[in-house]
Interface confidence: low
């Protein structure tokens, strides 16, 4: 991707991180969320990225031969889901505060929550245009990654934001990758 720029939604961020602009020839992008399992707890976070952060990305899409006429604006979900005492106003901050421990915080990650489908036009060097239908991220959330530490005193389920009811396969596509396809 060319001309990639990212701005931060400051209500959720401590330190900016650029958007993740990787792509392959079919415009498929897998987002790397903020799942953070640290053997050393929080001691590495002197230059910490905290919170499930919504990074606003502006980029031009290219399939190798053609480039989008106008830039695509979307969110990139990044960062770490750290303990609520550290993050009083992060995304998902209302869930199960009293149960949150440093240990359990390591079992959450920042993932795509809401998406929308839109069409973009790519201008080709030979003068022709191509239209792609793509899915862009519009919101992020913290999601539990594992149940391996399900101690009875930790009601992890109560902290999970409700999932939107969608067709199973569409929900998978929307929440697990940014899917780009030829229309």
């Amino acid at each position: 991707f060319k001309n990639d720029a990212t701005e931060i939604l400051y209500s959720h961020v401590v330190k900016p991180v650029p958007a993740h602009p990787s792509s392959n020839s079919t415009l498929n992008q897998a987002r790397n969320g903020g799942r953070h399992f640290s053997n050393t707890g929080l001691d590495r976070n002197t230059r910490v990225q905290v919170g499930c952060r919504e990074l606003r990305s502006t980029k031009y899409i290219s399939d190798g031969q053609c480039t989008s006429i106008s830039p695509l604006k979307e969110l990139v979900c990044a960062g770490e889901c750290l303990p609520l005492p550290v993050l009083p106003n992060w995304i998902g901050g209302g869930y199960g505060t009293k149960y949150w421990s440093r240990r359990s915080s390591q079992e959450w990650r920042c993932v795509n929550d809401k998406t929308r489908t839109q069409r973009i036009q790519l201008q080709c060097q030979d003068g022709s245009t191509r239209t792609y239908k793509i899915t862009v991220v519009t919101a992020c959330k913290c999601k539990r990654y594992t149940r391996q530490h399900n101690e009875s005193s930790h009601n992890f389920e109560s902290m999970s934001p409700a999932k939107p009811v969608q067709h199973h396969r569409e929900r998978k596509r929307a929440s697990k990758s940014s899917k780009h396809s030829m229309s």
Epitope: P18, H20, V48, K172, K176
Partner: antibody
Framework: QVQLVQSGAEVKKPGSSVKVSCKAS????????ISWVRQAPGQGLEWMGW????????RYNRKFTGRVTITADESTSTAYMELSSLRSEDTAVYYC???????????WGQGTLVTVSS | DIQMTQSPLSLSASVGDRVAITCRAS??????LNWYQQKPGKPPKIVIY???GLPSGVPSRFSGGGSGTDFTLVISTLQPEDFATYYC?????????FGGGTKVEIS
């Protein structure tokens, strides 16, 4: 296009250490998880651990705890895997792999053969 | 740790055949199951993610199904380039674990 390029093959003595590098290009390194997966000759795949490049946060497979150290250098977009106290059963191809959003490996390095022999 | 058990260990098939490989997890992993194809001397390649998601660029003859503990990878019409070893992998909890692999050979 995302690419992971690993360092070359190594021959090591039992008891020594090996450090394999994995240079990433074509993406934002700081917001990615790099895992290390090994494969002994004729055997299956074994996950060793991962690093979240933005913070250096790591998670290791208990089997390797104390012997494996995964690090990352943001300035060069390179991840490293160091395995110590090598034994013959550590002879394997070591892969670095970059995870997608929910724990599947979207991109892989070409692999580095580490041979442990006296 | 979650154990992943694949079956069969190997299978012989012909071009055009329908092939199914199963993977069983030692505990429920929801839909956090991925399938990889590996050819000799090459790194694995993702063919199905999240139990049934088809990555861009992977032919539609590959499909995945299942949830909880039992999963299936199906190749509807086997092609010459599909002869390889296939691995399942759970991404539900660390340590991430793989099945032992299923080698699809030419009969």
């Amino acid at each position: 296009q995302v690419q992971l390029v690993q360092s070359g093959a190594e021959v090591k003595k039992p008891g020594s250490s090996v450090k394999v590098s994995c240079k990433a290009s074509g993406g934002t390194f700081s917001s990615t998880y790099i895992s290390w997966v090994r494969q002994a000759p004729g055997q299956g795949l074994e996950w060793m651990g991962w690093i979240y490049a933005g913070t250096g946060g790591t998670r290791y497979n208990r089997k390797f705890t104390g012997r494996v150290t995964i690090t990352a250098d943001e300035s060069t977009s390179t991840a490293y895997m160091e395995l110590s106290s090598l034994r013959s059963e550590d002879t394997a191809v070591y892969y670095c792999a970059r995870e997608g959003v929910d724990g599947w490996f979207t991109y892989w390095g070409q692999g580095t053969l580490v041979t442990v022999s006296s | 740790d979650i154990q992943m058990t694949q079956s069969p260990l190997s299978l012989s098939a012909s071009v055009g055949d329908r092939v199914a490989i199963t993977c069983r997890a030692s505990q429920s992993i929801s839909d956090s199951l991925n399938w990889y194809q590996q050819k000799p001397g090459k790194p694995p390649k993702i063919v199905i993610y999240a139990a049934s998601g088809l990555p861009s660029g992977v032919p539609s003859r590959f499909s995945g199904g299942g949830s909880g503990t039992d999963f299936t990878l199906v190749i509807s019409t086997l092609q010459p380039e599909d002869f390889a070893t296939y691995y399942c992998q759970q991404s539900y909890s660390a340590p991430l674990t793989f099945g032992g692999g299923t080698k699809v050979e030419i009969s």
